[in-house]
Interface confidence: medium
């Protein structure tokens, strides 16, 4: 309102284009540039690609968990991924359940039976 | 569709609104700004799954998710630039830290799809 | 719950194109990730291509640039456009899918219905 006209007040403003817009992402690259930045020592740099990189990693993973959570829940018939969905979609995922050591809270647990306790009908032990 | 009901959307800007709660001397004091990746995840939930929604739950889940894999991939690569002797962390330190973190063809479909969003963001600069 | 149909192959000269198909049938066709797997004469079944639900497509080193990988959510159908293609690319053509939405669970061969193949000879 009223303002000085600035140096570039005759030309079109050019939209910003935020870097994850750039790169084709989700995942926030300027938030994870900062935080990559704040990680490493008082001297050290982190390079602009770093965090595209790792934007693109941290998007990919989560949508490979989701990806899989997501069929879980409909397999299941539910509209909504909950932690069960989670755990079944990780721990039946060779790679996710080595990568993720973690304990899901309020995932439950994978449905197993062993072998030796699956008698054949009519063999049933008594006490 | 719309996500189901329970499953609250989350927040526009990811971070928890900075309220004021009133102290007992009358001031006003300020919560902390405390951020998170839902958004992100949410957006990326709707890319995959278009009709199915997160409880919040599972969001804080995917959440520490994300911050577990970053604080992982960030140290690994902090320490690789470190030995090198080289004082700037760059995508090449990053995809080190990748193929040495995740296992087999999780990290070989990873470092594609980084590789392609570096492409993807140096080709639009 | 999906059955799969490979049809398109044949006898083509070396540097001419090939475009296989793959119709399924079967109930929620777009939730699945659709790939292709060939087998050379004497050796095992390697993984081509692979489309997801949602995240794109992924192909094997030997075939980049030269193969395309698509999917009609609305005809059911999943393509392999094969460009440039050379004597190594002879073999039978098998097309996949798996009920996970995951071209990285499809590309290890984990793929829960196979379709049966189609012959692909370059001369």
């Known amino acids: 309102a009223g303002g000085k006209a600035g140096k570039d007040s005759g030309k079109a403003k050019t939209k910003a284009v935020s870097r994850s817009q750039r790169a084709g992402l989700q995942f926030p690259v300027g938030r994870i540039h900062r935080h990559l930045k704040s990680r490493t020592t008082s001297h050290g740099r982190v390079g602009a690609t770093a965090a595209v990189y790792s934007a693109a990693i941290l998007e990919y993973l989560t949508a490979e968990v989701l990806e899989l959570a997501g069929n879980a829940s409909k397999d299941l018939k539910v509209k909504r991924i909950t932690p069960r969905h989670l755990q079944l979609a990780i721990r039946g995922d060779e790679e996710l359940d080595s990568l993720i050591k973690a304990t899901i809270a309020g995932g439950g647990v994978i449905p197993h039976i062993h072998k030796s306790l699956i008698g054949k009908k009519g063999q049933q032990k008594t006490v | 569709p719309e996500p189901a009901k329970s499953a609250p959307a989350p927040k526009k800007g990811s971070k928890k609104a900075v309220t004021k709660a009133q102290k007992k001397d009358g001031k006003k004091r300020k919560r902390s700004r405390k951020e998170s990746y839902s958004v992100y995840v949410y957006k990326v939930l709707k890319q995959v799954h278009p009709d199915t929604g997160i409880s919040s739950k599972a969001m804080g889940i995917m959440n520490s998710f994300v911050n577990d894999i970053f604080e992982r991939i960030a140290g690994e690569a902090s320490r690789l630039a470190h030995y090198n002797k080289r004082s700037t962390i760059t995508s090449r330190e990053i995809q080190t830290a990748v193929r040495l973190l995740l296992p087999g063809e999780l990290a070989k479909h990873a470092v594609s799809e980084g590789t392609k969003a570096v492409t993807k963001y140096t080709s639009s600069k | 719950q999906v059955q799969l149909q490979a049809s398109g192959g044949g006898l083509v000269q070396a540097g001419d194109s090939l475009r296989l198909s793959c119709a399924a049938a079967?109930?929620?066709?777009?939730?699945?990730?659709m790939g292709w797997f060939r087998q050379a004469p004497g050796k095992e079944r390697e993984f081509v291509a692979a489309?997801?639900?949602?995240?794109?497509?992924t192909y094997a080193d030997s075939v980049k640039g030269r193969f395309t990988i698509s999917k009609d959510n609305v005809k059911n159908m999943a393509y392999l456009q094969m460009n440039s293609l050379k004597p190594e690319d002879t073999g039978v053509y098998y097309c996949?899918?798996?009920?996970?939405?995951?071209?990285?669970?499809?590309?290890?061969?984990?793929?829960?219905?196979w379709g049966q193949g189609t012959q692909v000879t370059v001369s």
């Open positions: 996949a899918a798996t009920s996970s939405g995951s071209t990285r669970q499809l590309s290890t061969g984990r793929s829960n219905y």
């Open positions: 079967g109930r929620s066709f777009s939730s699945y990730a």
């Open positions: 489309i997801s639900r949602s995240r794109g497509v």
